[in-house]
């Protein structure tokens, strides 16, 4: 059964997923998808990393942690009830049937209070503005304009708690992490 995570409408939801790179910078491709993990890759992909960088993402989905150190936890910005459901984190370790896959269940609850006015900052510096994504036909490059501003105050309770290293370690010990090498 899937591990369950909760957030309120309007907050940012946090879905933890970690691995330990065999060596610094020796990254493993990871995909996140909406829906349980299928046989290969992720279904309804919302974000991918390759051996170097985030190479595909859709609006509202981003990696807040240091993915170069194996923190590939997904943040979903400003969630709605429609964001409820199962999400797949797949760590595509090279080899014969080596993939590690984790199904995480996100439960969105109606907001209790109206959010207060929020500070905003430009998030575009965190990611390159050009990304090349795999696709059919000729290689395609998407040019992105400014990425959405990120609401710093709209971080879910769980995400705030995860900044506490003790809880982060608990999560790592709970099975949503994999050591490589």
């Amino acid at each position: 059964s899937e591990v369950e995570y909760r957030a309120e409408v309007g907050q940012n939801a946090y879905l933890p997923c970690f691995y330990t790179p065999a060596a610094p910078g020796n990254l493993v491709p990871v995909c996140w998808g909406k829906g349980a993990c299928p046989v290969f890759e992720c279904g309804n992909v919302v974000l991918r990393t390759d051996e170097r960088d985030v190479n595909y993402w859709t609006s509202r989905y981003w990696l807040n942690g240091d993915f170069r150190k194996g923190d590939v936890s997904l943040t979903i910005e400003n969630v709605t009830l429609a964001d409820s459901g199962i999400y797949c984190c797949r760590i595509q370790i090279p080899g014969i049937m080596n993939d590690e896959k984790f199904n995480l269940k996100l439960v969105i609850k109606p907001a209790k209070v109206t959010p207060a006015p929020t500070r905003q900052r430009d998030f575009t510096a965190a990611f390159p503005r050009m990304l090349t994504t795999r696709g059919h036909g000729p290689a395609e490059t998407q040019t992105l304009g400014s990425l959405p501003d990120i609401n710093l105050t709209q971080i879910s309770t769980l995400a705030n708690e995860l900044r506490d290293s003790r809880l982060a370690n608990d999560l790592r010990d709970s099975g949503a992490t994999i050591r490589i090498g």
Partner: antibody, heavy 123, light 107 residues
Framework: EVQLVESGGGLVKPGGSLRLSCAAS????????MTWVRQAPGKGLEWVAS????????YYLDSLKSRFTISRDNAKNSLYLQMNSLRAEDTAVYYC????????????????WGQGTLVTVSS | DIQMTQSPSSLSASVGDRVTITCRAS??????LTWYQQKPGKSPKLLVY???TLAEGVPSRFSGSGSGTDFSLTISSLQPEDFANYYC?????????FGQGTKLEIK
């Protein structure tokens, strides 16, 4: 036009080996997962093995992974299946298939198939 | 392994008929189901993926439905070119598995 052309099939004795090839054209081969599926005479379809874009990740039917090896050469737009220690029950038409892919999708179903190559294992 | 069971194994129908083929998975596969058509001596052709999405170029008389363990493929008005074998395939669990097939014949 997308084309997948298999070759390398034929008659082989039990315990023998064969290497099947699949030549791909009409698309960017390195953007796609590729798969081998087989079909014994008069029978249904059976998945054999799949390989990811760059060949670093491979997937097999458990009962075949000790004898069969899937590989690819993106520079040559080619997919391969090395089959060792062949048995009579490996007799089948072997199809090369492309994993359907578009942005935000996953390559778990197959949108183009080759015409197949027949492998017959018999003494 | 996830077992896929198709029914019926064979079906006789006439041009213009509405026919439905069903596929049952041995466990929940969500919507990770694909349908293929195969004519004798030919390679399979993708018809429907993710249980209900019609593949490019497939006539609208074909439709897929279902989720979880029970799925169906419906042809609303059979055409002469539709007489063929049909296979379902799940892509939730490793290994990928196919149904045993349904042979659709002319009555």
């Amino acid at each position: 036009e997308v084309q997948l052309v298999e070759s390398g099939g034929g008659l082989v004795k039990p315990g023998g080996s064969l290497r099947l090839s699949c030549a791909a054209s009409g698309f960017t081969f390195s953007d796609y997962y590729m798969t081998w599926v087989r079909q014994a005479p008069g029978k249904g379809l059976e998945w054999v093995a799949s390989i990811n874009y760059d060949g670093r990740n491979t997937y097999y039917l458990d009962s075949l992974k000790s004898r069969f090896t899937i590989s690819r050469d993106n520079a040559k737009n080619s997919l391969y299946l090395q089959m060792n220690s062949l048995r009579a029950e490996d007799t089948a038409v072997y199809y090369c298939a492309r994993g359907y892919y578009y942005y935000g999708s996953s390559p778990n179903y197959f949108d183009y198939w080759g015409q197949g190559t027949l492998v017959t294992v018999s003494s | 392994d996830i077992q896929m069971t198709q029914s019926p194994s064979s079906l006789s129908a006439s041009v213009g008929d509405r026919v439905t083929i069903t596929c049952r998975a041995s466990e929940n596969i969500y919507s990770y189901l694909t349908w293929y058509q195969q004519k004798p001596g030919k390679s399979p052709k993708l018809l429907v993926y993710n249980a209900k999405t019609l593949a490019e170029g497939v006539p609208s008389r074909f439709s897929g439905s279902g989720s979880g363990t029970d799925f169906s493929l419906t042809i609303s008005s059979l055409q002469p070119e539709d007489f063929a074998n049909y296979y379902c395939q799940q892509h939730y669990g490793t290994p990928l598995t196919f149904g045993q097939g349904t042979k659709l014949e002319i009555k």
